[in-house]
Amino acid sequence: YDFTNCDFEKIKAAYLSTISKDLITYMSGTKSTEFNNTVSCSNRPHCLTEIQSLTFNPTAGCASLAKEMFAMKTKAALAIWCPGYSETQINATQAMKKRRKRKVTTNKCLEQVSQLQGLWRRFNRPLLKQQ
C-alpha cells in the first residue's frame, strides 16, 4: 500500500490521543536504556510503511502484536485516514485470523514496540531536512 495520500495530521492526532499511551502501557516496566532503535524512516509515507510492517507482520520471536490495543487503533486510524487502505488489508486480515495465537509479551516484542515508538516519533516530526 502507498501511504502518500493519507491524512497525516489526522493520523498524528490519533496517535497522540490514544495510540502513544497504549504503547507506553505496553512498555511499562521496561528500562528506557534497554533497546536501541535500529529501524528508521525518512518521510511520513515511509514511516507509515515501516510502522505497518512492524505492527502487523509477525516476526521471529514476536508473532502477536497485531492483536494488541495499540495495533487495533493503528489499523483503525489507517483505515479511516488512508484512502483504500482497508481494501488492501482484507486478505491480510483473513490470513492473520487463521494463525491466531495466544498473546505472549516476549523481550523481542518489547524491542519491536520500542522500535515502533521511534518510528512514530519520526512520523510526528518528519525529515530533519528543511520542510
Epitope: E9, A13, Y15, L16, S20, I24, S32, T33, E34, F35, N36, N37, S40, S114, Q117, G118, W120, R121, R122, F123, N124, R125, L128, K129, Q130, Q131
Partner: antibody
Amino acid sequence: EVQLVQSGAEVKKPGSSVKVSCKASGYAFSNYLIEWVRQAPGQGLEWIGVIDPGNGDTNYNENFKGRATLTADKSTSTAYMELSSLRSEDTAVYYCAREDNTGTAFDYWGQGTTVTVSS
Amino acid sequence: DIVMTQSPDSLAVSLGERATINCKASQSVSSDVTWYQQKPGQSPKLLIYYVSNHYTGVPDRFSGSGSGTDFTFTISSLQAEDVAVYYCQQHHRFPLTFGQGTKLEIK
C-alpha cells in the same frame, strides 16, 4: 533517571569559537533527537538546531547556518554544539534538550551553559 | 519563518484567580503547539504538548486549547509557585520558533 549535563561557563573573544557539550544519561542516547536552544540575557528562547544522534542528521536555523555545528558521540552519549565567528550578540545561555517520547516537545533540558563574548 | 506572538507581554493575577495567555501564529501550525514554564535562573520546563496534552506530573490547573493560528494557555487557579515566564512554541515547521514569552506575576 534521564539527565542532560552541560559543560561549564565560557568566556570568549569576538571572532573565536566555543564548543558546548551535553552528556546524556538514563536513556538510549541514539533513540531521541537532541535540540539546542539559546537565551540571550533578559530575552526569550531561540532555536539553534537539532541532531539525530542515531545517524548524525541535522537541521539548523538559517540564522546559525555556517556558524553552528552540531555533532554527537554515541560512544560517550554526548552531544556537542560548536559556534564559530563569535560576536557580542552571541552572549547567552545555551541549552540542550531532548525530544519527548512522542517527538512533539522537549521534555528534558540541560542546566544551561553561559557563554560570554567580550573583548 | 513562522512567528509566534504572545499576549500580553506581562500579566498580574491574584492568587486563586484565572490567568490566560494567548499565542498567535503567523500561519497555521495545525495543533503543533507546546507550552513551557521558565522560572528565574532555571531551565524551561515542559507543561503542555500538542495543544492540550498534559506532560507527566503537570497539575490539572494548567490547560491549553486552540488550533490553526490561535492558541490559549490557562491556569485555572493561580498558585504562588506559578510565578514564571511562559513560552509557546510551534513544532510544525523548521525552524522551530518560540513566542517572546509572557511574564506572570501575582497581583
